[in-house]
């Protein structure tokens, strides 16, 4: 019951987180004009990952897309990539986790399969959350750097005569949405991983044992040639030269009738 609750809660938290990551990625307010020096501006600027906007005194907002790919800063491209990777991983994670939910029965899916799927989706959510947090943090760092650079040369004069206040940008709402959403996705992923441990079936205390003849039986073993040429049931293409000596894989495989003397 606790496992189902943990898994369900992990799924819901991750779902909210991924929805938040998508929302943050689409939002225009990644950076907003800092109003400290001009709190009464009639023209308000803000920028997103995909376009920049200007709200004018009339109340009209004009947005223009970044219609260039090569002309954009590498950091912005990196942030875009991180957010998209986060969304893609999160979406795949959601898809996997739906089938992994203990409360949903799909055919005769074993608990071990559900446990594996839960773990997979959990890891995907963790990576997705980290991607979002990283993306938002890189952008925030870029803003801080630019903010202090523009503060240093706040007034760029035309021949030292004219005062032109340089527009500075500060953290926009999207950054906070991104951080929170990334955190939620991360928490959801951790919860899924915890739930996976409870879903995994208990390991059996016995293993299949195979008995081998002490002599060099390689000449009499059918399939020996096939194994070496890759046509037999042993698709690992391990050549059998030494009688009785087995690779780890073969020791743990189910015994065949040829192993008994």
């Amino acid at each position: 019951m606790a496992v189902t609750a943990c898994q369900g809660l992990g799924f819901v938290v991750s779902l909210i987180g991924i929805a938040g990551i998508i929302a943050a990625t689409c939002m225009d307010q990644w950076s907003t004009q800092d109003l400290y020096n001009n709190p009464v501006t009639a023209v308000f600027n803000y920028q997103g990952l995909w376009r920049s906007c200007v709200r004018e005194s009339s109340g009209f907002t004009e947005c223009r897309g970044y219609f260039t790919l090569l002309g954009l800063p590498a950091m912005l491209q990196a942030v875009r990539a991180l957010m998209i990777v986060g969304i893609v991983l999160g979406a795949i994670g959601l898809l996997v986790s739906i089938f992994a939910l203990k409360c949903i029965r799909i055919g005769s899916m074993e608990d071990s399969a559900k446990a594996n799927m839960t773990l997979t989706s959990g890891i995907m959510f963790i990576v997705s959350g980290l991607c979002a947090i990283a993306g938002v943090s890189v952008f925030a760092n870029m803003l801080v750097t630019n903010f202090w650079m523009s503060t240093a040369n706040m007034y760029t004069g035309m021949g030292g005569m004219v005062q032109t206040v340089q527009t500075r940008y500060t953290f926009g709402a999207a950054l906070f949405v991104g951080w929170v959403a990334g955190g939620l996705t991360l928490i959801g992923g951790v919860m899924m991983c915890i739930a996976c441990r409870g879903l995994a079936p208990e390991e059996t205390n016995y293993k299949a044992v195979s008995y081998h003849a002490s002599g060099h039986s390689v000449a009499y073993k059918p399939g020996g040639f096939k194994a070496s040429t890759g046509f037999g049931s042993n698709t690992k293409n391990k050549k059998i030269y030494d009688g009785g000596a087995r690779t780890e894989d073969e020791v743990q495989s189910y015994p065949s009738k040829h192993d008994y003397v």
């Epitope: 004009q33 001009n38 009464v40 501006t41 009639a42 023209v43 600027n45 920028q47 920049s52 200007v54 004018e56 005194s57 009339s58 109340g59 009209f60 004009e62 223009r64 004219v162 005062q163 032109t164 206040v165 340089q166 527009t167």
Partner: antibody, heavy 115, light 113 residues
Framework: QVQLVQSGAEVKKPGASVKVSCKAS????????MHWVRQAPGQRLEWIGY????????SYNQKFKGRVTITVDTSASTAYMELSSLRSEDTAVYYC????????WGQGTTVTVSS | DIQMTQSPSSLSASVGDRVTMTCKSS????????????LTWYQQKPGKAPKLLIY???TRESGVPSRFSGSGSGTDFTLTISSLQPEDFATYYC?????????FGGGTKLEIK
């Protein structure tokens, strides 16, 4: 077409209040801020303030702060500008202005403050 | 507040003349966000409401004749009428549309010579 129709001329005594209305038509009223501008005889145009019809947010010229109140009735697509504690220097033509680039102006409302 | 200074305050010219009037702002009206100068020019005739001529310092409003042109950037702006027509005799105002309070110039009155 976009039109702003203002209320008629007003004659007020000093210390009184005046409320000018501005009815908008031909566009979505909540799309643009509504600004108010006045022009005293032979003087330059003077911005009073604006209101965002979406949320009722306002911004006023410090010169009129405390004396001016701009409101809207979105259901009637009408904006109002109320100026209190009137003085003789408030005698002017009051305009409402809207749309992008503040392109559309009302016909103006003459407010005369005289004892 | 941004101060807007227009010159000359009055100007006499004849039909067909090319006239130029200037407007200076105490602060830059340039917005780096969209690379626009937030200066607007209006024409006002006696007893009428002002009419928008030019926005963003140089963009003509639709329906405004091509003889009207605006130029300038930062703090210095110019309105030019290439060939004066009888209906152009009026008062012209420049306006700061960049910072509140929005402020207007004192106007340039264009009169018939």
């Amino acid at each position: 077409q976009v039109q702003l129709v203002q209320s008629g001329a007003e004659v007020k005594k000093p210390g009184a209040s005046v409320k000018v209305s501005c009815k908008a038509s031909g566009y979505t009223f909540t799309d643009y801020n509504m600004h108010w501008v006045r022009q005293a005889p032979g003087q330059r145009l003077e911005w009073i303030g604006y209101i965002n019809p979406n949320n009722g947010g306002t911004s006023y010229n410090q010169k009129f702060k405390g004396r001016v109140t701009i409101t809207v009735d979105t259901s009637a697509s009408t904006a109002y500008m109320e100026l209190s504690s009137l003085r003789s220097e408030d005698t002017a033509v009051y305009y409402c202005v809207t749309t992008r680039y503040l392109a559309v102006w009302g016909q103006g409302t003459t407010v005369t403050v005289s004892s | 507040d941004i101060q807007m200074t227009q010159s000359p305050s009055s100007l006499s010219a004849s039909v067909g003349d090319r006239v130029t009037m200037t407007c200076k702002s105490s602060q830059s009206l340039f917005n780096s966000g969209n690379q626009k100068n937030y200066l607007t020019w209006y024409q006002q005739k006696p007893g009428k409401a002002p009419k928008l001529l030019i926005y963003w310092a140089s963009t003509r409003e639709s329906g405004v004749p091509s003889r009207f042109s605006g130029s300038g950037s930062g703090t210095d702006f110019t309105l030019t009428i290439s060939s004066l027509q009888p209906e152009d005799f009026a008062t012209y105002y420049c306006q700061n549309d960049y910072s509140y309070p929005l402020t207007f110039g004192g106007g340039t009155k264009l009169e018939i010579k």
